[in-house]
């Protein structure tokens, strides 16, 4: 299963549930199907509350039982620790892949922790990162903020996805905006053609 | 190109055992999933389970469970779709298609067919 | 059981659109139903027109676009032409694999 890096508010708008929750156990197969689940504690909803209506909470995370079939695999034995977890919602059920975007909620920049929680969502619809993996390239359109985290640090964790999100600034451009949050390095280019 | 092929139509007798093939070829054999699916005469499209060539993990829906048998040779990059003992109802065309895996599971490769008659 | 139903048949006239609906069996509020979209024309195999909702296979005409609301999901062919007519299929995975039970396209 081959995953395009994937920048979080990317994550974050092509997602259709994004919450915080602890993975209580081992998964348990779904006789009959092609999927196992992970049963899950919920701690709080960062998106969704639209699409799950009155639902107040998710018991599992569903997810293709093999590897081979893009399954996601939980290898944390902690059962404390509290995960980022960006998935989609098929008949009411929380699903994640292995391509989903889901990490330690401590893993995350401070920047991005607050991102998810309340500034991401001012890009959804309006705004797309453009992901940059090899040189030359160039923005396609005013609404796209050109991400060159691949290029400029040969990860897909870069200052751009630790700390910046690609938001309106006005009806027809978007840009890289700072998250607010300090930072102890110095900062590439926020918006540039590559 | 990415292509699968599949064996020539069948006119058997019930009772009689067989087995049909599915060529893979212009990709990794082993990396994807193989489907079969079921199409009886002027009727829709039913799945009847998938193998994983690389290990031959294989996973069959309910409704074929015990019917048939699937199996995979990777090193001629060739899935198996196999009867027993055909019964009339078995009469019907089918097709091998690739499985793709993400984000969600889907077919976008799909055999020619295999017409499988069978009748006393 | 899990069933995704379609209308047996929808006609069009060249240069019409029509819409072809999927509807999943869950009663789940928020059930959204992510589908695949397959063209099957008489005598010959399925072939994928639409994945992941509203992704096109490269090579598929852009007059092909799906969509979904909740647990309805749509294909819709714009500009309908003669070659249109077909048979088509929804798919799911989820919770289990499963076909529509296909729409038969009439272009008049």
């Known amino acids: 299963c081959s995953c395009a890096p994937t920048h979080p508010q990317t994550a974050f708008c092509n997602s259709d549930l994004v919450i915080r929750a602890k993975f209580m156990g081992s998964p348990e197969i779904i006789e009959t199907t092609l999927y196992q689940r992970y049963e899950i504690k919920m701690t709080k909803m960062l998106k969704g509350f639209d699409a799950v209506g009155n639902a107040t909470g998710f018991r599992f995370a569903y997810t293709p039982a093999m590897e081979s079939l893009c399954g996601y695999v939980h290898k944390s034995q902690n059962r404390s620790e509290e995960f980022l977890i960006a998935g989609r919602l098929r008949n009411g059920n929380l699903h994640i892949t292995a391509c989903s975007f889901l990490v330690p909620w401590h893993n995350l920049s401070p920047a991005q922790q607050k991102a998810f929680v309340k500034t991401y969502s001012a890009g959804c619809g309006v705004c797309t990162v453009f992901p940059c993996s090899a040189i030359p390239c160039k923005l396609e359109s005013d609404s796209h903020c050109l991400w060159t985290d691949q290029i400029l640090m040969g990860s897909e964790k870069g200052y751009q996805s630790d700390h910046f999100a690609c938001l309106p600034r006005n009806p027809d451009l978007c840009t890289w905006q700072y998250l607010g949050v300090s930072m102890t390095r110095s900062l590439p280019l926020a918006k540039a053609e590559a | 190109q990415v292509q699968l092929v599949q064996s020539g139509a069948e006119v058997k007798k019930p009772g009689e055992s067989l087995k049909i093939s599915c060529k893979g070829s212009?990709?990794?054999?082993?990396?994807?999933?193989i489907g079969w699916v079921r199409q009886m005469p002027g009727k829709g499209l039913e799945w009847m389970g998938i193998?994983?060539?690389?290990?031959?993990?294989?996973r069959y829906s309910p409704s074929f469970q015990g019917q048939v048998t699937i199996s995979a040779d990777k090193s001629i990059s060739t899935a198996y779709l196999q009867w027993s003992s055909l019964k009339a109802s078995d009469t019907a065309m089918y097709y091998c298609?690739?499985?793709?895996?993400?984000?969600?599971?889907?077919?976008?490769?799909w055999g020619q067919g295999t017409l499988v008659t069978v009748s006393s | 059981d899990i069933a995704l139903t379609q209308p047996a048949s929808v006609s069009g006239s060249p240069g019409q659109s029509i819409t072809i609906s999927c509807t999943g069996t869950?009663?789940?509020?928020?059930?959204?139903?992510?589908v695949s979209w397959y063209q099957q024309h008489p005598g010959k195999a399925p072939k994928l027109m639409i994945y992941?909702?509203?992704n096109r296979p490269s090579g598929v005409s852009n007059r092909f676009s799906g969509s979904k609301s909740g647990n309805t999901a749509s294909l819709t062919i714009s500009g309908l032409q003669a070659e249109d007519e077909a048979d088509y299929y929804c798919?799911?995975?989820?919770?289990?694999?499963?076909f529509g039970g296909g729409t038969k396209l009439t272009v008049l």
């Open positions: 193998i994983y060539p690389g290990d031959s993990d294989t």
């Open positions: 992941d909702v509203s």
């Open positions: 212009g990709y990794s054999f082993t990396s994807y999933w």
């Open positions: 869950s009663s789940d509020v928020g059930g959204y139903n992510y």
């Open positions: 298609a690739r499985l793709f895996t993400y984000p969600f599971l889907y077919f976008d490769v």
């Open positions: 798919q799911s995975d989820f919770p289990v694999m499963v």
